[in-house]
């Protein structure tokens, strides 16, 4: 009778095992083992027992011991079960960002592993088991569906294989896939709110504000603000579930025209975008041109107002005739025109908005000097010893220098309070002098003596 020890073995793939073939008869004609495995006989004294080292066991095998005794031939099989952990335990790739409320399918693939009867596949969220199934097929595939919730944000999903060889006196062998970290998000269907000037003048700065509510997680939201090809650099302020992105925008002459202002909010693998058109315009203040800013009295003066080709101007409140970007007026300069303001107002329509610009120029009229009766009376009669202020105002532009002298030497103190004496009496020659010329006027001062009773 042939016997084999051990009759059942579980061993790691590629491992070795010692198998003892024995026979009950003392002098067997033959004792050996039949196996395709590499084998070594580990010699022992005696004839009724042989020990073989079977090596590089890659798959389940059934070596057979045989013996040939006087009472006949017999055999005994040993059952070698190979175990090995899976070569691949993998979660099918998924986008890391998943919208809240979506059904997420987790798919675990397991390649290899034996014995399959002892191999289980477990899908997990953190340490919580979602599904447990035996490994079936090659590759084995286990799937489960998860309804994505807000509180799943940052959760690790993984797949674990359990090769449980504890019933065979071995251990529980576990293999775990690389974790899949779920990032959940909520991006509302409403587009972001974009507040910006509809029109913007070249070489000025404007402020753009983009905001959106109902985001999760708001800190992960990316905000892209752009005007045409110009990326803006916003300062973003976050609320619990909202943000507000504020950016300054500067425009140059190159940007003139209609530009597209974009605010895009990207969260997870979704985005919401708001577009707005901004008209960039160039509108310099109108130009007021005087033939000469400073003219002599009586000179013909042309006042012109020129503005943007599409603007409409009014000059000193008078609209251009015909209505357009140019207006002018002609005048003969009088002293009354000195310091006169000529105001040009231009109006330009940009994207339905009326933009106003003004420019003012002042005319200087050179005239005089002038001494007239109203401002410099030719006759004064004052009681002796009274307090008087001699007044004589010379007019002209530039303002003339005025001197009043009696006999060419004695001055009349113009604009000063004096006590009237006999010395003050007489005729004075008042001379007003400026770059425009000179005028004279005689002024007589009469002093009334007091009556003595």
């Amino acid at each position: 009778q042939t016997s084999v020890s051990p009759s059942k073995v579980i061993l790691p793939r590629g491992g070795s095992v010692l198998v003892t073939c024995s026979t009950s008869c003392d002098q067997p004609k033959l004792l050996g083992i039949e196996t395709p495995l590499p084998k070594k006989e580990l010699l022992l004294p005696g004839n009724n027992r042989k020990v073989y080292e079977l090596s590089n066991v890659q798959e389940d095998s059934q070596p057979m011991c045989y013996s040939n005794c006087p009472d006949g031939q017999s055999t005994a099989k040993t059952f070698l079960t190979v175990y090995w952990t899976p070569e691949r335990v993998e979660l099918a790739p998924l986008p890391s960002w998943q919208p809240v409320g979506k059904n997420l399918t987790l798919r675990c693939q397991v390649e290899g592993g034996a014995p399959r009867a002892n191999l289980t596949v477990v899908l997990l969220r953190g340490e919580k088991e979602l599904k447990r199934e035996p490994a079936v097929g090659e590759p084995a595939e286990v799937t489960t569906t998860v309804l994505v919730r807000r509180d799943h944000h940052g959760a690790n999903f993984s797949c674990r294989t359990e090769l449980d060889l504890r019933p065979q006196g071995l251990e529980l062998f576990e293999n775990t896939s690389a974790p899949y970290q779920l990032q959940t998000f909520v991006l509302p269907a409403t587009p972001p709110q974009l507040v910006s000037p509809r029109v913007l003048e070249v070489d000025t700065q404007g402020t753009v504000v983009c905001s959106l509510d109902g985001l999760f997680p708001v800190s992960e939201a990316q905000v892209h603000l752009a005007l045409g090809d110009q990326r803006l650099n916003p300062t973003v302020t976050y609320g619990n579930d909202s943000f507000s992105a504020k950016a300054s925008v500067s425009v140059t002459a190159e940007d003139e025209g209609t530009q597209r202002l974009t605010c895009a909010v990207i969260l997870g693998n979704q985005s919401q975008e708001t577009l707005q058109t901004v008209t960039i315009y160039s509108f310099p203040a109108p130009n007021v041109i005087l033939t000469k800013p400073e003219v002599s009295e009586g000179t013909e003066v042309t006042v012109k107002c020129e503005a943007h080709p599409r603007a409409k101007v009014t000059l000193n409140g008078v609209p251009a005739q015909p209505l357009g970007p140019r207006a002018q007026l002609l005048l003969k300069a009088t002293p009354e025109d000195n310091g006169r303001s000529f105001s040009c107002s231009a109006t330009l329509e940009v994207a339905g908005q009326l933009i106003h610009k003004n420019q003012t120029r002042e005319l200087r009229v050179l005239y005089g000097p002038r001494l007239d009766e109203r401002d410099c009376p030719g006759n004064w009669t004052w009681p002796e010893n009274s307090q008087q202020t001699p007044m004589c105002q010379a007019w002209g532009n530039p303002l003339p220098e005025l001197k009043c002298l009696k006999d060419g030497t004695f001055p009349l103190p113009i604009g000063e309070s004096v006590t009237v004496t006999r010395d003050l009496e007489g005729t004075y020659l008042c001379r007003a002098r400026s770059t425009q010329g000179e005028v004279t006027r005689k002024v007589t001062v009469n002093v009334l003596s007091p009556r003595y009773e």
């Epitope: 010692l18 070594k40 580990l42 010699l43 022992l44 004294p45 020990v51 080292e53």
Partner: antibody, heavy 116, light 107 residues
């Protein structure tokens, strides 16, 4: 009947070389493993080296690694131990023995004396 | 390397005595332990393999036990031909190592 016979021992100077032979009969050396075990005078047993004659895989005790080489010629059913750079502490009776994990059959041993 | 320590190093006993020799490994070696008997001027002889497996032709008074790190060779009734030196040997990992030996002498 399984039999192992060693030969090649003798007196050698330190730094010298010696080649021991182990002729096997009653079995095919390719079907098992051959080891060399030594015993210094009055001392215990010390495993030296092993060969798998089927594929010439070898393993050595770190004390002799690099100095000793175990080999086999399955056509002659003989194993060898080439000993180089011999030292006084290599003085011992060298046994060739067979089996895998235990040593079931031993030769009579050959004495190697390393001395100047 | 795994160290094998035998105790006692030597013992004196009388014919018929029960003799126990122990062997301790410096780390677990499962059952990969074998016992040998050596008489002066002779090659060692295998008595027990794999801690407890008997050998054809070896008297049944020799038995082995143990697993892990502690092993025992028992001679149930010492006979005159049993006076010799006994060695244990591990084959759990390379290099294979022997105990220092236990000499059994006549009392």
């Amino acid at each position: 009947e399984v039999q192992l016979v060693e030969s090649g021992g003798g007196l050698v100077q330190p730094g010298g070389s010696l080649r021991l032979s182990c002729a096997a009969s009653g079995f095919n050396i390719k079907d098992t493993y051959i080891h060399w075990v030594r015993q210094a005078p009055g001392k215990g047993l010390e495993w030296v080296a092993r060969i798998d004659p089927a594929n010439d895989n070898t393993i050595y005790d770190p004390k002799v690694q690099g100095r000793f080489t175990i080999s086999a010629d399955d056509s002659k059913n003989t194993a060898y131990l080439q000993m180089n750079s011999l030292r006084a502490e290599d003085t011992a009776v060298y046994y060739c023995t067979t089996s895998g994990y235990w040593f079931a059959y031993w030769g009579q041993g050959t004495l190697v004396t390393v001395s100047s | 390397d795994i160290q094998m320590t035998q105790s006692p190093s030597s013992l004196s006993a009388s014919v018929g005595d029960r003799v126990t020799i122990t062997c301790r490994a410096s780390q677990s070696i499962s059952n990969n332990l074998h016992w040998y008997q050596q008489k002066p001027g002779k090659a060692p002889k295998l008595l027990i393999y794999h801690a407890s497996q008997s050998i054809s032709g070896v008297p049944s008074r020799f038995s082995g036990s143990g697993s892990g790190t502690d092993f025992t060779l028992t001679i149930s009734s010492l006979q005159p031909e049993d006076f010799a030196t006994y060695y244990c040997q591990q084959s759990n990992s390379w290099p294979y190592t022997f105990g220092q030996g236990t000499k059994v002498e006549i009392k």
